[in-house]
Interface confidence: medium
């Protein structure tokens, strides 16, 4: 996250970290008891390794009561996401087992109603990711919130050049961005989960490039049918 | 550049030993599982065993026609993987290819193929 | 094992026209995590197989859109739009979803 601060401990309950080999990879999102949400692109390059999904944490290092890393059971990658674009970019993780609930671990309620978020709204995003341009790490949750930006503009030559497609929504980005390490995190609009972080290799903190997420409500049937 | 350059083939007598190489660089190799695929002359592809990332064991799996013949390793530091092939028969002759594993596919990198012949 | 058959063993297409290749596998190729591992690859003449589409639909990185993947259970379909002279070789269909993994026996595409 660039140009925001670190989070309240523990005030989102719902945000994951998926991980490769015991290290923080992407972001992701409790939806329900065993599932969590997050971006198809963050294990392309997982290889052979081992993903796991953390839950319950504030600090990546450090111990806290209400930390745990579950195993996956089940990766679903969305059928039609694709190695070359930004389009169809969830995956839905399924864990080893219902993951212990409590005020750190809760799922969050996402968005089934498939109309545009209104552009101005302030939008909260969350993650582990980079915090500047040198590729610091943070170890502890990091959060910014961004206005949501209409489609027209963020579908500019000068911005994404038509590549935003309904399925997909923006947030301004000028010096305050989601980044490296943020993809597969959550956008919350008024408490409600909007939009996951992709994770393209788009440049952070420019306002010329905002940031795009993809928006869930156009994929209500597609988490509906994994989670039946 | 993702390459895979295997070595080590050749002319062999049946019943006898060869063992293939193949150099990995371009990637992180240590988090790839990895595997042997084969093709004999005017013949189509047939997989022959696999070896599993660090993370996962090391576990190493084979097809039935190589089980208890052929063993596939691994050195890390050395981004090396081999095919260590024990009482070669004639219908070993073929072209072995070293390729890479992904997560949400099989194989997305090939290397050029080691020429295996088993001919008295 | 699981058994990949391919049809037709040789297809003469004229340039840019649509062929067809289908898949059968003897036995359902779903896998315990629930995704399919169908993939297609082409070898074109003396070079390395390549990696065409993965999960039965999804395209791999740098392939032209005129290569399609369908099908689900046990039969599987690959399509290529519009035939171009680079896509002369011999596809193959493989299933990575159970041990031993298995190729189908290839079908050679040429020009009619």
């Known amino acids: 996250i660039l140009g925001g601060r670190e989070a309240e401990a523990h005030a989102r309950p719902y945000m994951a970290s998926v991980q490769l080999n015991g290290a923080h990879l992407c972001g992701g999102v409790l939806v329900a008891e065993q599932w969590v949400l997050s971006a198809a692109h963050c294990l392309e390059d997982a290889a052979d390794g081992k993903v796991q999904v953390l839950l319950g944490a504030h600090s990546l290092s450090q111990p806290e009561p209400s930390k745990r890393l579950y195993d996956v059971l089940r990766a679903v990658p969305h059928p039609d996401s694709q190695p070359d674009t930004i389009d169809h970019d969830l995956l839905l993780l399924q864990l080893s087992e219902k993951a212990t609930l409590g005020p750190a671990v809760r799922p969050l309620p996402w968005q089934r109603v498939d109309r545009d978020v209104a552009p101005g709204t302030l939008c909260d995003v969350a993650g582990w990711g980079i915090v500047n341009h040198a590729g610091r790490r943070p170890d502890s949750l990091q959060h910014v919130l961004l206005p949501v930006l209409d489609r027209a503009t963020c579908n500019r030559r000068t911005h994404h050049d038509g590549a935003i497609t309904e399925r997909l929504m923006c947030a301004e980005s000028n010096r305050r961005d989601s980044c490296k390490g943020d993809s597969g995190g959550p956008l919350v609009c008024g408490g409600v989960l909007e939009g996951v972080v992709t994770s393209g290799s788009r440049v952070c903190g420019n306002r010329k490039k905002p940031g795009i997420y993809t928006r869930v409500a156009s994929y209500a049937a597609w988490i509906d049918s994994v989670l039946a | 550049e993702v390459q895979l350059v295997e070595s080590g083939g050749g002319l062999v007598q049946p019943k006898g030993s060869l063992k293939l190489s193949c150099a990995a660089s371009?990637?992180?190799?240590?988090?790839?599982?990895m595997n042997w695929v084969r093709q004999a002359p005017g013949k189509g592809l047939e997989w022959v065993a696999r070896?599993?990332?660090?993370?996962?064991?090391?576990?190493?799996y084979y097809a039935d026609s190589v089980k208890d013949r052929f063993t596939i390793s691994r050195d890390d530091s050395e981004s090396m993987v081999y095919l260590q092939m024990n009482n070669l028969k004639t219908e070993d002759t073929a072209m072995y290819y070293c390729?890479?594993?992904?997560?949400?596919?099989?194989?997305?990198?090939w290397g050029t193929g080691t020429t295996v012949t088993v001919s008295s | 094992d699981v058994l990949m058959t391919q049809t037709p063993l040789s297809l003469p297409v004229s340039l840019g026209d649509q062929a067809s290749i289908s898949c059968r596998s003897s036995?359902?190729?779903?896998?315990?995590?629930?995704?399919?591992?169908l993939e297609w690859y082409l070898q074109k003449p003396g070079q390395s197989p390549k990696l065409l589409i993965y999960?039965?639909?999804n395209r791999f990185s740098g392939v032209p859109d005129r290569f399609s993947g369908s099908g689900s259970g046990t039969d599987f379909t690959l399509k290529i739009s519009r035939m171009e002279a680079e896509d002369l070789g011999v596809y193959y269909c493989?299933?990575?979803?159970?041990?031993?993994?298995?190729f189908g026996g290839g079908t050679k595409l040429e020009i009619k």
């Open positions: 036995q359902s190729i779903v896998h315990s995590d629930g995704n399919t591992y």
């Open positions: 371009g990637f992180s190799f240590n988090t790839y599982a």
């Open positions: 390729v890479r594993h992904g997560y949400y596919w099989y194989f997305d990198v």
């Open positions: 493989f299933q990575g979803s159970h041990v031993p993994y298995t």
């Open positions: 070896i599993r990332s660090k993370s996962n064991n090391y576990a190493t």
């Open positions: 999960r039965v639909s």
